[in-house]
């Protein structure tokens, strides 16, 4: 903690403006009213303050909203919002979308991505919803960050919303994230033709059922391998050989490269050798002719 | 290291007869679909004829459908192709290559020239 | 049978230029086309599969685009070991059928 020290009459401050720099660390904290501070915010970022400076800042800032800081602050905090942990964050009620885009903009070219999750953790809580103006807001500002949020956060997500969301913005989602998105991306699509729908369903198909995989397999989609490595391990085990040949058409090609990456090294442990050479791609690992497979799972549940 | 190894060409008067073989080595031969292609003097690449993995499947080009037989023998490793009835236009330079659509690996081809 | 018509058949270019070499199927062949490279006295190597994935180990400068009837191989920088006879070939059907290739040389 800063010393506690009095502050000298000459340097007591009325406003808040650019003779700041020239304090010490221990003058700031004896000369800076936080109430003036708060107030005069939308000036802190014009000014060039170190590193050093900027903590005694939020030390201050600190003192005078123990509970979290009001939207009125969080908006003006410009690089001060650098100094900000998790913790501090997660204590904010954030609405407004202009307060997030100015916090983006600032956070931007910094490793913040725990805190920047947390900024939009608080703005859909605060929002009541993740909805369109927000969605498009995080697409425009901070590509990827659509996947920073809980999968409980996405659930709040309208289908009617799904369409605004670019491929590149489910680029770093989880297969639990995936799993909330992708039925309603299948709502949100349903109505479209087969070629079209598969273009826009594709990014969320991570988080698509064995069943919806199969049927897609019906459609000559020529799945690519990319997004067919992307599918959930669950999904592409029960597909036979048929249907995997069916759904990548011209990408089946590229299976032998994948051969030892799941979920392909998985799916040729299913199958067995005589199917997968049908393929006539050299794939290696099934089932050898003459064996029996025993699904033990069904003994187990049964017994 | 995948090696694919052809032989069997030669000189040949027309009407007559050669039974090319590949020889294949460094992977599992059998769960692989193999191609027969060729290259005329100075023309492109030309495709002869494919067979599955187990020899049950068998597709030509019409020009050479009647006249030449694509074969394998899993046991050994060697995938054949019979040429019978053949013409000066068969003159090229065969090749064997894998894959199932897309040639991965080529041999280093065997002439075949059809002159009386 | 699905013809293959390669444009243009040779052209030159220099080290560092962007090069484009086009194939068109007489009928639709959607994305069941694959480009090759070959380089005198050597085998054919396949670049791109499947109109636009780049085969494992082919250099990124590479790349492929179109469906349908219309496909372009792209090298964006050409490097020296990239002056060859380039070859398009479609299997969406048999006969497998090959384009009459284009020849990339030195300018």
């Known amino acids: 903690d800063v010393e506690r020290t009095t502050c000298p009459p000459e340097k007591e401050v009325h406003e808040i403006d650019e003779s700041l720099i020239f304090y010490k660390k221990r003058e700031l904290e004896a000369c800076v009213d936080a109430a003036l501070l708060a107030a005069q915010m939308d000036r802190v970022d014009a000014i060039p303050f170190t590193y050093e400076q900027l903590d005694v800042l939020k030390h201050k800032l600190d003192e005078l909203y123990p509970q979290g800081y009001p939207e009125s602050v969080i908006r003006h905090l410009g690089h001060l919002f650098l100094k900000m942990s998790p913790e501090d964050i997660r204590k904010w009620n954030v609405t407004s979308l202009e307060t997030l885009k100015a916090l983006l903009k600032v956070s931007k070219g910094h490793e913040m991505s725990a805190q920047v999750a947390t900024l939009i953790d608080r703005v859909v809580v605060g929002r009541g919803q993740l909805d369109k103006d927000t969605v498009d807001t995080l697409t425009a500002f901070c590509p990827g960050c659509l996947c920073s949020l809980s999968p409980e956060r996405l659930s709040s997500v309208p289908p009617s919303v799904i369409g605004a969301v670019r491929p590149q913005d489910l680029d770093t989602c989880g297969p639990r994230q995936l799993d909330v998105l992708y039925p309603k991306a299948r709502l949100a699509f349903q109505n479209m033709s087969g070629s079209e729908y598969f273009v826009k369903i594709r990014p969320f198909l991570g988080g698509a059922p064995t069943e919806d995989v199969k049927a897609l397999s019906q459609q000559n989609v020529s799945m690519d391998l990319a997004t067919f490595m992307k599918l959930r391990r669950e999904a592409v085990l029960p597909l036979t050989v048929a249907e995997v040949q069916k759904l990548l058409g011209p990408h089946v090609e590229g299976l032998k490269v994948e051969e030892q990456h799941s979920p392909v090294r998985d799916w040729i442990l299913k199958q067995r050798q005589d199917d997968l050479d049908t393929l006539g791609l050299g794939l290696q690992g099934g089932i050898p002719n003459g064996y029996l497979i025993l699904d033990l799972s069904v003994r187990e549940a049964l017994s | 290291e995948v090696q694919l190894v052809e032989s069997g060409g030669g000189l040949v008067q027309p009407g007559g007869s050669l039974r090319l073989s590949c020889a294949a080595t460094?992977?599992?031969?059998?769960?692989?679909?193999m191609h027969w292609v060729r290259q005329g003097p100075g023309k492109g690449l030309v495709w002869v004829s494919r067979?599955?993995?187990?020899?049950?499947?068998?597709v030509y080009a019409d020009s050479v459908k009647g006249r030449f037989t694509i074969s394998r023998d899993n046991a050994k490793n060697t995938l054949h192709l019979q040429m019978n009835s053949l013409r000066a236009e068969d003159t090229a330079v065969y090749y064997c290559?894998?894959?199932?659509?897309?040639?991965?690996?080529w041999g280093q081809g065997t002439l075949v020239t059809v002159s009386s | 049978d699905i013809q293959m018509t390669q444009s243009p058949s040779s052209l030159s270019a220099s080290v560092g230029d962007r090069v484009t070499i086009t194939c068109r199927a007489s009928?639709?062949?959607?994305?069941?086309l694959t480009w090759y490279q070959r380089k005198p006295e050597k085998a054919p190597k396949s670049l791109i599969y499947?109109?636009?994935s780049l085969q494992s180990g082919v250099p990124s400068r590479f790349s492929g685009s179109g469906s349908g009837t219309d496909f372009t191989l792209t090298i964006s920088s050409l490097q020296p070991e990239d002056f060859a006879t380039y070859y398009c070939?479609?299997?969406?059907?048999?006969?497998?059928?090959f384009g009459q290739g284009a020849k990339l040389e030195i300018k």
């Open positions: 290559a894998r894959g199932r659509g897309i040639m991965t690996y």
């Open positions: 067979i599955n993995s187990d020899g049950t499947s068998t």
């Open positions: 009928q639709d062949i959607g994305s069941w």
């Open positions: 460094g992977f599992t031969f059998s769960s692989y679909w």
């Open positions: 070939q479609q299997y969406k059907s048999y006969p497998l059928t």
């Open positions: 499947a109109a636009s």
